[in-house]
Interface confidence: medium
């Protein structure tokens, strides 16, 4: 496997087994300092493929509250404000990392978990299957 | 310090300082078993607010590769395939958790970090500011 040059100040770990257990500092560094806090907050209403946000809550997970987008329509909103079914509203999905306590209720032991979340919706041209 | 009721099978941690360091198992549990692997893969081209995917790579971060969406146009693609500047293509952003090696190059020591990523684009009606 790959050998990473080791910083002499690294914590020692004799456990070379996979699955790997690592030390993680929970003083979370937030890199989003210069972002507009409003961000995408009103796009869900102004989009031609608008969506509703549903709360997905799990107190044994971090982050415990994740907002899931559900497209409001099968079609997209046209210039007249009506739903055009010649186009499709589809969810944009992303795989994200979350932390889950493992074993349950242990304050100092976690497992990384991947979950798929719908972040918002976009309007796409449908794939039309022509029958010969 | 705070005493949290402890599962008897928990790893011990005497460090009651803040920031806290915990053990994290990197054998990732993937909850996305019944999802279509194609997912949003072709939406970036079929969307009325199409986007390009840029590879953001950082060997000191886990995951080391993150794909960032950049909207192709300021406007949106209309029914004729032209860019309509009366509408706006905007990125849908999401805050995600990543692990960053800390100190750098340490294979077993990380810090949690939050970063903001653009997942895809959606077409929105612009906010028009009328001058009195």
């Amino acid at each position: 496997g790959i050998t990473i040059p080791r910083n002499p100040g690294c914590p020692n770990s004799e456990d070379k087994n996979f699955p790997r257990t690592v030390m993680v500092n929970l003083n979370i560094h937030n890199r989003n300092t210069n972002t507009n806090p409003k961000r995408s907050s009103d796009y869900y209403n102004r989009s031609t493929s608008p969506w509703n946000l549903h709360r997905n809550e799990d107190p044994e997970r971090y982050p415990s509250v994740i907002w899931e987008a559900k497209c409001r329509h099968l079609g997209c909103i046209n210039a007249d404000g009506n739903v055009d079914y010649h186009m499709n509203s589809v969810p944009i999905q992303q795989e994200i990392l979350v932390l889950r306590r493992e074993p349950p209720h242990c304050p100092n032991s976690f497992r990384l978990e991947k979950i798929l979340v719908s972040v918002g919706c976009t309007c796409v041209t449908p794939i039309v299957h022509h029958v010969a | 310090g705070i005493t949290i009721p402890r599962n008897p099978g928990c790893p011990n941690s005497e460090d009651k300082n803040f920031p806290r360091t915990v053990m994290v198992n990197l054998n990732i549990h993937n909850r996305n078993t019944n999802t279509n692997p194609k997912r949003s893969s072709d939406y970036y081209n079929r969307s009325t607010s199409p986007w390009n995917l840029h590879r953001n790579e950082d060997p000191e971060r886990y995951p080391s590769v993150i794909w960032e969406a950049k909207c192709r146009h300021l406007g949106c693609i209309n029914a004729d395939g032209n860019v309509d500047y009366h509408m706006n293509s905007v990125p849908i952003q999401q805050e995600i958790l990543v692990l960053r090696r800390e100190p750098p190059h340490c294979p077993n020591s990380f810090r949690l970090e939050k970063i903001l990523v653009s997942v895809g684009c959606t077409c929105v009606t612009p906010i028009v500011h009328h001058v009195a």
Epitope: L26, R55, P63, S64, V65, F110 | -
Partner: nanobody
Framework: QVQLVESGGGLVQPGGSLRLSCTAS????????MYWVRQAPGKGLEWVAN????????YYVDSVKGRFTISRDNARNSLYLQMISLRAEDTAVYYC????????????WGQGTLVTVSS
Amino acid sequence: QVQLVESGGGLVQPGGSLRLSCTASGFTFSNYSMYWVRQAPGKGLEWVANIKQDGSEEYYVDSVKGRFTISRDNARNSLYLQMISLRAEDTAVYYCAKGEILPLYFDHWGQGTLVTVSS
């Protein structure tokens, strides 16, 4: 969307009492441990007290034991901190925070309520 709103702070003389309240919205209040933390002028954040989801267990930093009482009303989505025998060193901005599984890590804070203990 998660919101925490504190109230009840003010100016009080040493030995006096105050009751802080925190109203929560945007999450299922009864599913989470809740915390009070404080920040004295020019100092870092200090954990003060926390209470389990059902109110069955409470924890306090040593300096407030016997003087502060944390409680909650899940039906009203509310958290409280009753403070008696207040001292000058209790002067701080008090925040309520939603407990996460990460020990002593809080994603969501209120705007805080200032408690000033002075004669």
